[in-house]
Amino acid sequence: QLLEPCGYIYPEFPVVQRGSNFTAICVLKEACLQHYYVNASYIVWKTNHAAVPREQVTVINRTTSSVTFTDVVLPSVQLTCNILSFGQIEQNVYGVTMLSGFPPDKPTNLTCIVNEGKNMLCQWDPGRETYLETNYTLKSEWATEKFPDCQSKHGTSCMVSYMPTYYVNIEVWVEAENALGKVSSESINFDPVDKVKPTPPYNLSVTNSEELSSILKLSWVSSGLGGLLDLKSDIQYRTKDASTWIQVPLEDTMSPRTSFTVQDLKPFTEYVFRIRSIKDSGKGYWSDWSEEASGTTYEDRPSRPPSFWYKTNPSHGQEYRSVRLIWKALPLSEANGKILDYEVILTQSKSVSQTYTVTGTELTVNLTNDRYVASLAARNKVGKSAAAVLTIPSPHVTAAYSVVNLKAFPKDNLLWVEWTPPPKPVSKYILEWCVLSENAPCVEDWQQEDATVNRTHLRGRLLESKCYQITVTPVFATGPGGSESLKAYLKQAAPARGPTVRTKKVGKNEAVLAWDQIPVDDQNGFIRNYSISYRTSVGKEMVVHVDSSHTEYTLSSLSSDTLYMVRMAAYTDEGGKDGPEFTFTTPKFAQGEIE
């Protein structure tokens, strides 16, 4: 049997609006007063087990005490009424949970969506947090008929239990209710067919065209409520390696369709496509994107000839010379397909020509010392590129005209080369470069630039702190012009080692120091100057700076019969490096001098 409580707190289920004041009362039963020899002045109010300050408490009469709270902010408080029986024993009389929060805001932004094949889902913005249990009910009706209420589980959306009826307008609104109030949203009126989100198109396939290398044909299956709806499409595509999508203009896909030809594509390129659909009126929602499908455009003949150059080997006697024709494989964007081979035609005169079919990117031919014209075309399964033409002049012809003001400089981690064109019209320029080294041969790389170019960067994989010899040759219709060369670094560093100094001649008061240039492999940059530091065992160090063109230097005003320690450092633009220390002793007397 449960014991009757000694009293009650009113209200029994208090809910308070945050920031407002609230008063509760505790009423003791008469029997309780007599049993414990107490009255209302013995009441102790507690919130979450902590005594409420006396100033918040009012004794109304012998049975009733009230407590007042101002600016209530805590979401939940345990409020208890207790009595001090027999002067000191605290006895709980009654307890309630005091909740605080806000009345519901008027729901806004009510929207509904009919996901194809599912019931209608409506969503709304409930406004600020109420901090209280709040019921949201989605109401819907026709002009003549009410539909079942939809009780929201999450307070922001609800999926109705009935299938939508299309082509009849429905009215929808949300009611929100909690202990502090009840409110309704504005109602919305619509035809569910205008809220449809179709399922994504499927079976997307991509086919190419042998006739046109710039198109791909797409076909797909649309749903649209089983053909009940006419849908328009949105098509996007990208190259296989790209991250951004290209949009097919929406005006091109406005009419209902299940196929489309995408134009202006690059030949022999793999493209990825995706497609989505919406009701052709534009009302409703775009479907999710279809699964991606890819296809490759058909090959086209190469769009340009390869870069083309030659190197002449020393001639075998006087009658003929060996010429190595070299070219670069076309990038995919210009090859427009798989390059099967190259056609090289060498013509000495109208009556003498020789044709070669080459699978690699070089061909060595033997030519007399006459003038020849070499042409080169790349071939894929569709056809041949235009021909690159090179005139190979007689070795007895001296090349005239070269570029002027040739410069090279590093910028943005690239090695740039610029020049002023020669005064005669140029067909193209050839840039050649290699690493200068005393330990390995200069293995050349090269690139071709159009006639309009007079500034470019070297396109190979360049190494830092290596000395590059760069040569620029203008090519004319009559053959190559003169070549101009220079040295450059992608990035300089301090030398790997400093110069080793030695004495060439030592006198009583001077010494001629000599050193070798640092090998190019150890220079790591342009040697700008040297410093020579010298000292005696007791004197202070002296430093002299020497221009990098020198390989010897005379120290003067030295003391006789003295040991000197000398060291040299070499400096590039990026710092210096000391060589080993060297010692020498000046003689006591000059040559022929007697004590």
């Epitope: 009658e319 020789q354 070669y356 033997n366």
Partner: nanobody
Framework: QVQLQESGGGSVQAGGSLRLSCVIS????????MGWFRQVLGKEREGVAA????????LYADSVKGRFTISQDSSKNTVYLEMNGLKLEDTGMYYC??????????????????WGQGTQVTVSS
């Protein structure tokens, strides 16, 4: 590697005929033209006849014009020298040669890079 193998040499009476053959192999690209040369002991090697492998243009030394004919069978990679009305002065070692030098057909021996071992032709009275 490149090889040239001559055959068909031998002894013949003046006024007689011989047909020399030369089979070529090992070329990445076919030679531009081929030729027949002969050498008599103690004398320089001299050009007899040449033929372009592409168009079949031919060239003959004045001393053999009208008597000798150079021809080829591309399918068999073979070059022939048909020798009629042989004279005593036609005696010598006959060499087949090939070149990849791109120029008009020539019997200048300095333009030829590849040579066979030779086949002996002897004309007696």
């Amino acid at each position: 590697q490149v090889q040239l193998q001559e055959s068909g040499g031998g002894s013949v009476q003046a006024g007689g005929s011989l047909r020399l053959s030369c089979v070529i192999s090992g070329f990445t690209y076919r030679p531009t033209f081929m030729g027949w040369f002969r050498q008599v002991l103690g004398k320089e090697r001299e050009g007899v006849a040449a033929i372009t492998t592409g168009g079949g243009s031919t060239l003959y030394a004045d001393s053999v014009k009208g008597r000798f004919t150079i021809s080829q069978d591309s399918s068999k990679n073979t070059v022939y020298l048909e020798m009629n009305g042989l004279k005593l002065e036609d005696t010598g070692m006959y060499y087949c040669a090939a070149t990849t030098v791109i120029t008009s057909v020539s019997i200048n021996r300095n333009l030829y890079q590849y040579w066979g071992q030779g086949t002996q032709v002897t004309v007696s009275s």
